[in-house]
């Protein structure tokens, strides 16, 4: 007889789940030279035991403790990027200007991102059929707490100039309930950061209007200043410019707004 | 500006012991969690050990659990690491680091223990 399984609202553990993890792992190590003493077996020990056999809508962030250990590693604080809604484009940047870092560019982040995982009280089984929505089901749940545990340190170790790259095409562009207003936002370390400076970039070409003086920035702003952090705002009108200047500094159209 | 000083390290005996200090400025000392992180010869960063801003959490990698003590006086900004029992693979760059990691910019210049007969 069948067991019965818990059906969830969200989408099951991806795929081959414990292999991508483990690959990514070995991937990794393997592009950067100071993270080669990685034990990768170990690190998916501790990531399977942070969620393996406990119930999925009661994972705490000392679940993914020994996985944090694992995952120790050096990031200049002066050098760190934050997004929001807006990942493709950051992680192309930080690509290019390799000196920069997204939460994605360490080991950590690496290892979880566009994946979904979780398991089932009492039983050593992953979930593959469902898995909790943050909003329907509970919030929790084995990814929600990952991304805010490690959303949480990275902001937490940042320091100096802090930048964060946001999506001006959408209606909010700062969104309180994202997890760059919601978790990242309220963790920089005033003590630490000097400036928050984002940048807003725009989706329509022709798109001149200025986005610094949306409501939501403003609002971002006041968050911000009230953390006793300055704020300072610049649009990228052009992201392909802007990326294209990225690559070639020296490029006599790179003189001009961007 | 977060600046640390790292003191103590040197060279010793297995089975000894080390009194590893760091003295800390430019940043309210009791507000932050501190860490102690460490370097071997030709590895990576290894996260030893981890204290919260009041002292009354504190937390250790598994490979010194029982051998190593994390403490701190925050009327003097100063962070310790008390290592008994020392073996050959504690010898490292000892540093201490602002919050509990696993990202760490570590600011001093850390300091070098070494065990060995």
């Known amino acids: 007889v069948p067991r019965w399984r818990q059906q969830w609202s969200g989408p099951g553990t991806t795929k081959r789940f414990p292999e991508t993890v483990l690959a990514r792992c070995v991937k990794y190590t393997e592009i950067h030279p100071e993270m080669r003493h990685v034990d990768c077996q170990s690190v998916w020990d501790a990531f399977k035991g942070a969620f393996i056999s406990k119930h999925p809508c009661n994972i705490t962030e000392e679940d993914y403790q020994p996985l944090m250990k694992l995952g120790t590693q050096t990031v200049p604080c002066n050098k760190i990027l934050l997004w929001s809604r807006i990942k493709d484009l950051a992680h192309q940047f930080t690509q290019v200007q390799r000196d920069m870092f997204t939460l994605e560019d360490t080991l950590l982040g690496y290892l979880a991102d566009d994946l979904t995982w979780c398991g089932e009280f009492n039983t050593s089984k992953i979930n593959y059929q469902s898995c909790p929505d943050w909003r329907k089901d509970c919030s929790n749940n084995p990814v929600s707490v990952f991304w805010k545990t490690v959303s949480r340190r990275f902001a937490e170790a940042a320091c100096d100039v802090v930048h964060v790259m946001l999506n001006g095409s959408r209606s909010k562009i700062f969104d309180k309930n994202s997890t760059f207003g919601s978790v990242e936002v309220h963790n920089l370390q005033p003590e630490k950061v000097q400036t928050l400076e984002a940048w807003v970039i725009h989706g329509g070409r022709e798109d001149s209007r200025d986005l610094c003086q949306d409501p939501t920035i403003k609002e971002l702003e006041s968050i911000i200043s009230k953390r006793n952090i300055q704020f300072s705002c610049k649009n990228i009108y052009r992201p392909d410019k802007f990326l294209q200047c990225v690559k070639n500094p020296e490029d006599s159209s790179c003189t001009s707004e961007i | 500006e977060v600046q640390v000083l790292e003191s103590g390290g040197g060279l010793v005996q297995p089975g000894g012991s080390l009194r590893l200090s760091c003295a800390a400025s430019g940043f309210t000392f009791s507000n932050f969690a501190m860490s102690w992180v460490r370097q071997a010869p030709g590895k990576g960063l290894e996260w030893v050990s981890g204290i919260s801003g009041s002292g009354g959490s504190t937390d250790y990698a598994d490979s010194v659990k029982g051998r190593f003590t994390i403490s701190r006086d925050n009327s003097k900004n100063t962070l310790y690491l008390q290592m008994n029992s020392l073996r050959a693979e504690d010898t490292a760059v000892y540093y201490c680091?602002?919050?509990?990691?696993?990202?760490?910019?570590?600011r001093g210049q850390g300091t070098l223990v070494t065990v060995s007969s």
């Open positions: 680091a602002d919050g509990t990691g696993p990202f760490f910019d570590y």
